[in-house]
């Protein structure tokens, strides 16, 4: 609904549309009979100038030609790209109170004319999809602005759609709602982008193709796979297609992985059989289409098959390690530990452990099925066993693997030598030693087993442990190291039927203790005292302890405290003094020491030799 | 000449309400046209609501549309913003404007905007 201007008219000079840099006039003038009604000649027209319809400017300094109470002309420069307002405004100047009327509006909308449009590009999406071209319409005009697409093809074929660009929206595609079918495949076609606005127009360049540049099949659908006797590694692929069809180019890749297996496959009809796939892993599959198999463009992919293939039976071997603690005189206990299965060994969930112990010689055989990774059992001390291990999952079991029970670390002549623990960063440590001086037959392997140095661990833990080759003699264990934390770690240096180890501790990372041991008694024998502490609580040694102090000095004094320092041994838990004087009251305190330094003392206790009776 | 003098800002936290009202005085004619505006500390004053006299529709900006609800009552010449379900976003100063309803060569009639509040400040914290 337009709204008359019924006190005057409001023109522009040359136009309401300019282009940028130019100068307009804008002329006000009242109707007849209307303004101030009094007094004609007091008159005074005024123009005020609005941005986004907010007032920025009173261009009474612009005025360039005045007929006194009937119209003024203003002269109006430097207009921004865009739309601006302008206002002509009656003002009545001998009545102060009433503010000026306004008059009338009028639009100045600067601008530039259209640039030809660039890199049109058409397509048609499917056999049945009609023709759609978009293009570049260049720099932006600041004006509403008309585009025509025009086709042309053979047998006068002709056609053409308009879209327009204005401040709210763009035009910069059009469909052209026509289907170009195969049986124009060797036809070309023109079209041209037209643009037209009120200060100009152009062209594009005519941009040529044909049936097959610009058709893109839709993508397959439909797509399933078939396991060929429920195998693992090998399906077929199935998929629907648009007729014209004739080349295929299938993705699949495991669902954590980041790189494709790409397969090109020309007159498919719909089916591939893929005979690499990894058992029990979850794929992800997509199809994309092409109608020639030299020209055209490629389909997009289609929508993802996701579905995991079959289990098989597990390959590869387990694993196994053991510790054996003797009960009595007759009877040992064998623990077996094991690693799981990568899952490309496993092949599919295991299910079981098949576990058998065997005595060689009498062929005594234990066996049992276990779903977890370690299995305990009472064996007499005598004879050779060995033991085997196999994971099953629902096609079948792996190849089992054999162990030798041999006394792991009874042959002193086949210990490693020079072990040391160095620390590497925050979870790691680097275990490296020598091989066995006089060994009498031959290392097959090193296994490094550590384990955390902390109540009840033996029990509450299974070991962590690595297989090292028999010319290897350095290992980083890296498995649930964390830092501040001691772990005893052992190298055993195992031989056919026999087994010798080196024992070490070590730490990733280590800090002084957090407090001193506390010393529980101090008793008196044969001029010696005994000094018995409990150890450091385990959160609080944070790192491996090295080596306890006891510091004592008399009661009283200022002079700086003995000291007597004694190798960390976690059995040891009293050490003798003996360099104390009779009848002088001493205060006695302990500390810990770590490869990061002193802990704080401990409590002090107050002791009184009392030394040989008389 | 027009008067305007707004009330009502404050703090208020994330989802709150408040209402903020604007009085008017002087030419009516001048103010056919009633509206808020805000400006948020380094942003370009923005037109939120707007109502006139004309006998049409508020006008609401996207960003605040279904939330605020602007009201005029011309008897007592204030028009007052509701502001609902308010958001850290919505922190500026509020400024209430008028101005006149212009007739337009070969376009409808448009509200321009003269004279101005003196602004409210309205904080939203999340």
């Known amino acids: 609904n337009i709204d008359v201007c019924k006190l005057g008219t409001v023109t522009v000079q040359p136009a309401p549309v300019i282009p940028l840099g130019s100068a307009a006039n804008i002329s006000c003038s009242l109707n007849p009979k209307q303004g101030c009604s009094h007094y004609p000649s007091s008159n005074e027209l005024i123009l005020l100038k609005f941005v986004n319809d907010v007032l920025v400017e009173n261009l009474h300094g612009k005025k360039v030609h005045d007929h006194t109470g009937h119209s003024s002309t203003f002269q109006v420069t430097n207009l921004s790209l865009g739309m601006t307002l302008f206002v002509c405004k009656l003002n009545c100047s001998n009545s102060q109170k009433k503010p000026p009327v306004p008059v009338c509006g009028v639009e100045i909308s600067v601008g530039v004319a259209p640039e030809p449009p660039q890199n049109i590009s058409c397509v048609q999406e499917g056999e049945n999809g009609t023709v759609a071209c978009s293009w570049n319409s260049g720099k932006v005009t600041y004006l509403k602005t008309n585009y025509t697409l025009q086709l042309s093809g053979p047998n006068n074929l002709t056609c053409q759609k308009q879209c327009f660009s204005d401040n709210r929206q763009n035009c910069n595609r059009l469909d052209l709602g026509i289907n170009l079918s195969p049986d124009l495949a060797e036809s070309r076609f023109i079209v041209r982008v037209t643009a037209i606005n009120d200060l100009g127009n152009s062209s594009s360049l005519p941009h040529t193709f044909t049936f097959l540049d610009i058709v893109i099949p839709l993508p397959p659908w439909d797509i399933r796979i078939n396991f060929l006797n429920a195998s693992g590694s090998r399906g077929t692929l199935q998929w629907e297609d648009e007729g014209q069809v004739v080349l295929n180019q299938l993705r699949y890749q495991p669902l954590n992985s980041t790189s494709w297996n790409m397969v090109n496959a020309t007159n498919a009809k719909g089916k591939y059989d893929l005979r690499d796939l990894r058992p029990f892993t979850e794929y992800e599959f997509q199809i994309s289409s092409k109608l020639h198999l030299s020209g055209g463009s490629w389909s997009n992919w289609s929508e993802s098959l996701r579905t995991r293939t079959p289990e098989e039976e597990p390959v590869g071997i387990l694993d196994i390690w053991y510790m054996k603690q003797d009960i009595d005189y007759d009877r040992q206990q064998i623990s077996l530990f094991w690693k799981s299965l990568n899952p490309s060994e496993a092949r599919g969930k295991i299910l079981h452990y098949q576990v058998t112990l065997q005595e060689v010689t009498k062929k005594t055989t234990l066996q049992n099925t276990t779903r977890h990774t370690s299995w305990t059992r009472v064996i007499p001390r005598t004879g050779a066993w060995t033991a085997s291990v196999s994971a099953a999952n629902s096609k079948g079991a792996s190849a089992p693997t054999h162990i030798n029970i041999v006394d792991l670390c009874g042959t002193g002549l086949l210990a490693p030598h020079q072990v040391s623990a160095k620390s590497e960063n925050m979870d790691n440590i680097l275990v490296t030693w020598q091989p066995p001086k006089k060994a009498d037959s031959a290392v097959r392997e090193y296994i490094v087993e550590w384990r955390a140095l902390q109540p009840g661990s033996i029990t509450k833990f299974p070991p962590h442990w690595l297989r090292i080759p028999p010319d290897n003699m350095s290992a980083l264990i890296s498995e649930n190291i964390k830092p501040y934390i001691c772990y005893e770690i052992r190298v055993h240096a195992l031989s056919e039927s026999q087994g010798g180890c080196s024992s070490i501790r070590g730490d990733s990372k280590h800090k002084a203790p957090v407090s001193g041991p506390h010393i529980t008694a101090i008793t008196e024998k044969k001029e010696r005292l005994f000094i018995s502490w409990t150890h450091i609580p385990f959160p609080e040694q944070r790192g491996c302890i090295l080596h306890y102090r006891i510091y004592w000095k008399e009661r009283d004094s200022t002079a700086q405290p003995e000291l007597c320092e004694i190798q960390y041994r976690r059995s040891q838990n009293s050490h003798p003094i003996s360099s104390l004087q009779p009848r002088v009251t001493y205060v006695l305190w302990m500390t810990a020491v770590t490869a990061a330094g002193e802990s704080p003392q401990g409590n002090e206790r107050e002791f009184c030799p009392q030394g040989k009776a008389n | 000449q027009v008067q305007l003098q707004e009330s009502g800002g404050g703090s208020v936290q994330d989802g709150g309400s408040l209402r903020l009202s604007c009085a008017a005085s002087?030419?009516?004619?001048?103010?056919?046209?009633m509206g808020w505006f805000r400006q948020a500390p380094g942003k370009e004053r923005e037109k939120i609501a707007v109502a006139d006299t004309g006998g049409r529709s508020p006008y609401y900006a996207d960003s605040v549309k279904g939330r605020f609800t602007i009201s005029r009552d011309n008897a007592k010449n204030t028009v007052d913003l509701q502001m609902n379900s308010l958001k850290p976003e919505d922190t500026a100063v509020y400024y209430c404007?008028?101005?006149?309803?212009?007739?337009?060569?070969?376009?409808?009639?448009?509200?321009?905007?003269?004279?101005w509040g003196q602004g409210t400040q309205v904080t939203v914290s999340s």
């Open positions: 002087g030419d009516i004619y001048a103010r056919n046209c």
């Open positions: 404007a008028a101005g006149p309803l212009v007739p337009v060569v070969n376009t409808a009639a448009r509200c321009v905007y003269e004279y």
